[in-house]
Amino acid sequence: TTELTEEKYEYKEGQTLEVKCDYALEKYANSRKAWQKMEGKMPKILAKTERPSENSHPVQVGRITLEDYPDHGLLQVRMTNLQVEDSGLYQCVIYQHPKESHVLFNPICLVVTKGSSGTPGSSENSTQNVYRTPSTTAKALGPRYTSPRTVTQAPPESTVVVSTPGSEINLTNVTDIIRVPVFN
């Protein structure tokens, strides 16, 4: 068994969380990915990518931006203008059905506190960035970054959790539930 330990990020209000979630590209390149918040036993999907996934085409839902790189098996998640009420446990999942999601990596424990971030809000709230072109054995990506499109989605959906924080799960193939931000 493997314990899905939490990785903690501490921020002040107004700052930005950015994480990268790896997935087995041969299995999930064309699947929808989602970012969910753990709320009891029924986590809520906050944002999900469209199908089929397009390389580096951001999907924005409110303050959350998802960028999928299916050629590399990488989902980047960005939450801007963090608020105290955003505190909690989050996970990247492969979204296959509202009642069936595959957790990609260990939960992120986000702790947001009040107080000055010491950083101008304008730079924190920006979602634009210039990313390097990857130098890798995998295929190179296409255009680096386009303006995020806002996607109107239904209210958050519930999914069955693969594992609750701190619990242990049996892994038949550890690449299905993955922690690393580099590509499998």
Partner: antibody, heavy 119, light 108 residues
Framework: EVQVLESGGGLVQPGESLRLSCTAS????????MSWVRQAPGKGLEWVST????????YYADSVKGRFTISRDNSKNTLDLQMNSLRAADTAVYYC????????????WGQGTLVTVSS | EIVMTQSPATLSVSPGERATLSCRAS??????LAWYQQKPGQAPRLLIY???TRATGIPDRFSGSGSGTEFTLTISSLQSEDFAVYYC??????????FGLGTQVEIK
Amino acid sequence: EVQVLESGGGLVQPGESLRLSCTASGFTFNAYAMSWVRQAPGKGLEWVSTISGSGSTTYYADSVKGRFTISRDNSKNTLDLQMNSLRAADTAVYYCAKVAGSNFFFDHWGQGTLVTVSS
Amino acid sequence: EIVMTQSPATLSVSPGERATLSCRASQSINSNLAWYQQKPGQAPRLLIYGAYTRATGIPDRFSGSGSGTEFTLTISSLQSEDFAVYYCQEFIMWPPWTFGLGTQVEIK
């Protein structure tokens, strides 16, 4: 407790080869990317190479591309760095480092192994 | 390639005083920055990641701030064990992942 331990360093002549190894314990090895980072004597840190948890994707710094090969054996919890066509500029302490779970930083490091390339 | 510039190269501080180390990125890296401490003859140790979050076991006298291109590591009250070299590292997305040249914090 997470532990990584490097071995295989030594003195070689320019143009020769050397293979570094790293043994890891205390975490699910095949669920994390691993990297090599080096430090020339009296200098700063330089990222060298990274391999994904499954070993299917590798990355190299331009300075070693085509000469170094990173690989891993998940059944043995080992990471290797095959270094060919070594140059004096490759002289450094080579660290094996575990990549963190949600971003590309290094949360656990070995103590390093010294590679000296000199004629 | 993103260039990370650390300043000053050497910082002389008395024990108990505050130390402020700077790191500048050549382009925006949002909060994708880590700080490491390295003592002579030892491996680097992760201090801060995500620009602000202390790694497990790191005392709260260490704090990180900044975003975009300008970052700061502050040691509120220097202890004898804090005299070392400190490196910043960016991890915005694709390699190469680059380090700054380091700041040596020495006893004044």
